[in-house]
Interface confidence: low
Amino acid sequence: AGVFELQIHSFGPGPGPGAPRSPCSARLPCRLFFRVCLKPGLSEEAAESPCALGAALSARGPVYTEQPGAPAPDLPLPDGLLQVPFRDAWPGTFSFIIETWREELGDQIGGPAWSLLARVAGRRRLAAGGPWARDIQRAGAWELRFSYRARCEPPAVGTACTRLCRPRSAPSRCGPGLRPCAPLEDECEAPLVCRAGCSPEHGFCEQPGECRCLEGWTGPLCTVPVSTSSCLSPRGPSSATTGCLVPGPGPCDGNPCANGGSCSETPRSFECTCPRGFYGLRCEVSGVTCADGPCFNGGLCVGGADPDSAYICHCPPGFQGSNCEKRVDRCSLQPCRNGGLCLDLGHALRCRCRAGFAGPRCEHDLDDCAGRACANGGTCVEGGGAHRCSCALGFGGRDCRERADPCAARPCAHGGRCYAHFSGLVCACAPGYMGARCEFPVHPDGASALPAAPPGLRPGDPQRYL
């Protein structure tokens, strides 16, 4: 047994460009806390897989408010170590996940809100009893500096915390065959209580006569690497080539129970009896309890009174996830109608409506033309949340107050000259062209291309554009 200890030294912007904005502000003060998750072995595992070696939450750090205009500094940290107790042997190799969480202390209805700022992960080898190891990890633009160590809890000693030490019974020396427990020279190794022949390197025991194996070793004396464990099986015929007994279909072969669980065969298959702090069909889940405060955002923790039992978080409205850690994106349901902008304020949804619409969900279409007058005989047309005037001939602008210059857009093609007229515009076409906008060339034989000139108008005559 022992304790894994993690000391966070700093959390702040990493080197290089793209410094992150401070996670806190005058409007939204916040504080940080950390979560560590440990797993045995060097396997690449998803962040969601069980923390089989254990997990711990830090205390909350000091409240921090960003100074306007200042770059994000190293943020104030919680006091103390994160400690993850381990009950069995220290595995020597482990994976870790360290999460930095932000607790927002603004005007939150229903308590503070949490969000994950950064997550770093790594795989390390570490002997128990050794010095602090220092590490730097980066997550996006953030940098986390920390140290860690594994130490054994008395009376355990050794790189795996599997040897036991006891105070000396005699003042001068230890008993026959027992060495002093360095560095505690006043203590001696406890008498060997494990099963006779149990491998001192790969086996350990917690009770007399027991021989429990470290990861990667198996057999009654923990002397067989897992890859060759089939030679131990008592079932099946002997293999002529290897001299091994070929294993039969034993449900407990290879011990499917993780984390030191013991396997017993049942009529259907097998059942795992899990050590304290682990559960799951194969003892694969570690025991975080309600006392660890695993439910975020005001979630109610049910069950989990001790590490042998699970907990479940019942989340308040607006949050979801097994730890209520995820804010439901209520804006994804597009509650704001008529093009309104959705704002999720945490305690409430707010819709910012486009012009011409109102109501909690922008559901009311205002009368755009109410109180609006269009000048000079223009008529008001509703549409799209804004009024529009359809102006009488010769007038333009938003309210038809501007006298339109029909020639401003240069409507006469092929060099035709434009004249403003009380009812519109008139194009005087250049030789060889005709039409209301001088758009049609006149053929050399005198016939027009299309359409035919109206009676009474010769090609080249100015045509009034009605």
Partner: antibody
Framework: QVQLQESGPGLVKPSQTLSLTCTVS??????YYWSWIRQPPGKGLEWI?????????NYNPSLKSRVTISLDTSKNQFSLKLSSVTAADTAKYYC????????????WDQGTLVTVSS | EIVMTQSPGTLSLSPGERATLSCRAS???????LAWYQQKPGQAPRLLIY???SRATDIPDRFSGSGSGTDFTLTISRLEPEDFAVYYC?????????FGQGTKVEIK
């Protein structure tokens, strides 16, 4: 090997209270969640509620006002009471263990058909 | 509550064929807190898969689960005669615990 065995009447009159008991053998009732699920004839499964070994309960909101689940650790039993029953409560009622690690129903009994009829 | 919708309602296949059953949640089921059960006529449901992809004790490896978020799948790689049954998915992420309406796998 964990086994669950239900007991209780198969016929209940409308407006009365349905009572069922589930006895756990081959293992302790401690450290697990114990649940009731029902299945109307020809239909799907509906979770009724669970009780944790320390007595904490959680019920389906649709039935919450009528359901009580209790536990007797000395007898390794847990019980369901459903009050003010109607014909819509006619179903096969199952007791099951929720595995605390996987939070899924890993052991079930064979179920008891309860008919609500006068 | 999270509503679980299974499709198809009925799947008609022959022994030896591959069966793919779908389960969709009305909102994200975090950490894959989803289980699959098999139920035969007159019997209680039997746990097949938990955690979206972990096989329960004594379940043959022809059964596999996958998916995350809102979309989950149960695959039976080669149907055996004893696999013809009704299959239910169940989420245990958010209370209340809810089941899908079931998919019946029948012999073609």
């Amino acid at each position: 090997q964990v086994q669950l065995q239900e007991s209780g009447p198969g016929l209940v009159k409308p407006s009365q209270t349905l009572s069922l008991t589930c006895t756990v053998s081959g293992g302790s009732i401690s450290s697990y969640y114990w649940s009731w699920i029902r299945q109307p004839p020809g239909k799907g499964l509906e979770w009724i509620g669970y009780i944790f070994y320390n007595g904490i309960t959680n019920y389906n909101p649709s039935l919450k006002s009528r359901v009580t689940i209790s536990l007797d650790t000395s007898k390794n039993q847990f019980s369901l009471k459903l009050s003010s029953v109607t014909a819509a409560d006619t179903a096969k009622y199952y007791c099951a263990r929720i595995h605390s690690g996987s939070f899924s129903f890993d052991y079930w009994d064979q179920g008891t058909l309860v008919t609500v009829s006068s | 509550e999270i509503v679980m919708t299974q499709s198809p309602g009925t799947l008609s296949l022959s022994p030896g064929e591959r069966a793919t059953l779908s389960c969709r949640a009305s909102q994200s089921v975090s950490r894959g807190y989803l289980a699959w059960y098999q139920q035969k006529p007159g019997q209680a449901p039997r746990l097949l898969i938990y955690g979206a992809s972990s096989r329960a004790t004594d379940i043959p490896d022809r059964f596999s689960g996958s998916g995350s978020g809102t979309d989950f799948t149960l695959t039976i790689s080669r149907l055996e005669p004893e696999d013809f049954a009704v299959y239910y998915c169940q989420q245990y992420d958010t209370s209340p615990i809810t089941f899908g309406q079931g998919t019946k796998v029948e012999i073609k």
